[in-house]
């Protein structure tokens, strides 16, 4: 007799991808556009992206530090009506992307709470977040809550009304926050929060504390369903140097959780490239006209339309993790092992009951290394094969497709793989 | 300063093993790799692994596989290394030599310990 | 494993007079992510242990003379030291720093004419 097949977990539509973050509608759309009729336009390409939401804004009224002048249920006019809203939230519908709206209230000023009004900007989010739920919004990004007082309690109400009004609903809370501790105890306090925080930006130039951080982190937080960042509203180029953005990647992706980027980091978009340009939010680089700023500063591999005719870009390559993330049983919402393989490298399995399985082989090295893959680590339920297919490298000049023997895998410096082998009973 | 300060030099017979101790000062210990590196007399250098003291994670060089164990203590921030089953052709100066984390080149190097094997 | 090998075995150069050594690895160490090559120089004397010179092929460790340079790309490599000092009278290895097994040269003895 066939053994009984595992029963499939209840899956949320942001357990089954990558969430995508837009929260400077001008420096996204670039050439002195930024509108929300403007962003309707981009939507083929996030879906080319094969992302499942699109996190939004700030996109309300908000004059500087001024709670008077804050009014969380306008948009602001340079964005848009509520009409061009209705009309993005229709369109992005059609192509199965859902819409988070960012409503971090002082997002323009000092401090994005108004430390000193605290349970008038508590009222306003709360008459927020009905008024746009009931607009049709999938869910709310709250950043900063470092800077909440009794942010614990107060998500805890916010999360009532979203899960009240649907559980398909979801809220977003991010914190600058890198210290595990206050991330459990927010986390702790609220079931179905999904958290983005700096945790993985203590990782490291070099990526060696990767490893370490990932499983004291999944270790910690158990059962729980958790998203993967490395800052709350950053790009990835913000912290990691260029040979690591490919490696982060395809962990990010492969890694139990719903894995958050912002704008850019699909093609590796990076301020310190663009002179005079805001770290936090520097034009997205469409073409190369782009940044017409300095002459000659942006070459065509740096922008979508480059990358995008190149298959081993990193555009691409983001393409293709996203692509296998939202349809693959075991990186949807298989269990997960790491397990030793030698110094700089860090491996881990993807398997859900009897779907093909994922082997993860990243080396954080500088040097090319031999896998030692300690497979006497891994549960029965999760044995290695002797072979492998790989799906694909993070760098070229692999054969794609090819099975290799796990017994002499050799990686090259920096080099990320991803192997899919079957189910065997 | 940076300082890799290893253990006496040792006489064993064939068969047996030996464990070189490798003491590292004035760094971070589990922020760099340790390495093992051999120089027979007047002969040139022969790696033979890499330790992450971090982690303990290990990688060795195909000739010595099965026989060298590379080991930390983190808590003393030392480095061991000990091969087994010592051959005449063992005979030789062992160095410990760290690398900044992920390099394969070594910026700080002990002073050596010789390891005789006669019977 | 990548093989290192090294050339002449020994060298007498005059005091003052620029000193040559080559190295050929027997595959390219030239990474293409990062367009750099991973090969170091070492500088060893009587009953001390190396001391690292250069590496990525041609950046010197702080501390050393500008007098020592490294060049080369691919599989061809070259250390030169611009004028001889006396304190240069060593033996001096290459080594791969691109995979393990790292690998050395056999070395190059320098010595004063």
């Known amino acids: 007799r066939a053994p009984r097949c595992r029963e499939l977990p209840a899956q949320k539509w942001w357990h089954t991808g990558a969430l995508y973050r837009i929260g400077d509608l001008q420096a996204f759309q670039g050439h002195g556009a930024g509108n929300l009729a403007g962003l309707k336009g981009r939507l083929d390409y996030l879906s080319s992206l094969k992302v499942k939401g699109l996190v939004l804004g700030p996109i309300h009224k908000n004059q500087k530090d001024d709670v008077a002048q804050t009014d969380l249920l306008q948009i602001d006019p340079n964005f848009g009506s509520k009409e061009d809203f209705d009309s993005l939230l229709q369109s992005a519908k059609k192509k199965s992307i859902r819409v988070i709206l960012d409503l971090t209230p002082n997002y323009r000023g000092e401090n994005s709470w108004f430390s000193t009004q605290v349970d008038t900007v508590a009222t306003k989010v709360k008459d927020a977040l009905e008024f746009w739920l009931q607009a049709g919004v999938d869910g709310f990004q709250v950043r900063d809550i470092e800077n909440l007082k009794d942010a614990s309690s107060f998500l805890a109400e916010w999360q009532n009304i979203t899960k009240g009004f649907s559980e398909d609903r979801l809220l977003i809370a991010g914190t600058n926050s890198s210290d595990l501790q206050q991330i459990l105890s927010l986390l702790e306090s609220n079931k179905d929060l999904l958290l983005t925080s700096s945790y993985l930006s203590d990782s490291g130039s070099t990526g060696e504390h990767t490893k370490s951080l990932v499983t004291q982190y999944l270790n910690a937080t158990g059962n729980r369903w958790c998203s993967w960042s490395l800052s709350q509203a950053r790009l990835l180029t913000s912290f990691l140097p260029a040979q690591l953005l490919r490696l982060y990647q395809l962990m990010l992706f492969t890694l139990p959780g719903t894995p958050v980027f912002s704008y850019g980091d699909e093609i590796g978009l990076d301020a310190a490239a663009l002179p005079g340009q805001p770290m936090e939010a520097p034009v997205m680089l469409w073409d190369e006209s782009s940044f017409p700023d300095i002459p000659g500063a942006v070459s065509a591999n740096m922008t979508v339309k480059g990358q995008s005719e190149d298959p081993g870009s990193l555009l691409s390559l983001f393409r293709r993790l996203s692509d296998q993330r939202s349809k693959e049983r075991s990186l949807l919402h298989g269990d997960f092992h790491a397990f030793s393989a030698g110094p700089g490298l860090f491996s881990y399995i993807r398997h859900w009951d009897q779907n093909e399985r994922f082997l993860v082989v990243l080396n954080f090295g500088d040097v090319g290394l031999s896998a030692g893959l300690q497979a006497s680590d891994l549960p029965a339920s999760a044995s290695l094969p002797a072979k492998a297919d790989l799906l694909l490298s993070t760098q070229p000049g692999r054969e794609e497709g090819s099975p290799l023997e796990l017994e002499r895998l050799k990686l090259e410096p920096h080099e990320g793989l991803l192997l899919r082998f079957p189910y065997a009973a | 300063q940076v300082q890799l300060v290893q253990s006496g030099a040792e006489v064993k017979k064939p068969g047996a093993s030996v464990k070189v101790s490798c003491k590292a000062s004035?760094?971070?210990?589990?922020?760099?790799?340790m390495n093992w590196v051999r120089q027979a007399p007047g002969q040139g250098l022969e790696w033979m692994g890499i330790?992450?003291?971090?982690?303990?994670?290990?990688n060795y060089a195909q000739k010595f596989q099965g026989r060298v164990t590379s080991t930390v203590d983190k808590s003393i921030s030392t480095a061991y290394m000990e091969l087994s089953r010592l051959r005449s052709d063992d005979t030789v100066v062992y160095y410990c030599?760290?690398?900044?984390?992920?390099?394969?080149?070594?910026?700080?190097w002990g002073q050596g310990t010789l390891v005789t094997v006669s019977s | 494993d990548i093989v290192m090998t090294q050339s002449p075995d020994s060298l007498a150069v005059s005091l003052g007079e620029r000193a040559t050594i080559n190295c050929k690895s027997s595959?390219?160490?030239?990474?293409?992510?990062?367009?750099?090559?991973?090969l170091a120089w070492y500088q060893q004397k009587p009953g001390q242990p190396p001391k690292l010179l250069i590496y990525?092929?041609?950046t010197r460790e702080s501390g050393v003379p500008d007098r020592f340079s490294g060049s080369g790309s691919g599989t061809d490599f070259t250390l030169t030291i611009s004028s001889l000092q006396a304190e240069d009278v060593a033996v001096y290895f290459c080594?791969?720093?691109?995979?393990?097994?790292?690998?050395f040269g056999g070395g190059t003895k320098v010595e004063i004419k």
């Open positions: 330790i992450d003291p971090s982690d303990s994670e290990t």
């Open positions: 080594q791969q720093h691109y995979s393990s097994p790292f690998t």
């Open positions: 595959q390219s160490l030239l990474n293409n992510i990062n367009q750099k090559n991973y």
């Open positions: 990525f092929a041609s």
């Open positions: 030599a760290r690398a900044s984390y992920g390099k394969g080149y070594f910026d700080y």
């Open positions: 004035g760094y971070t210990f589990t922020s760099y790799w």
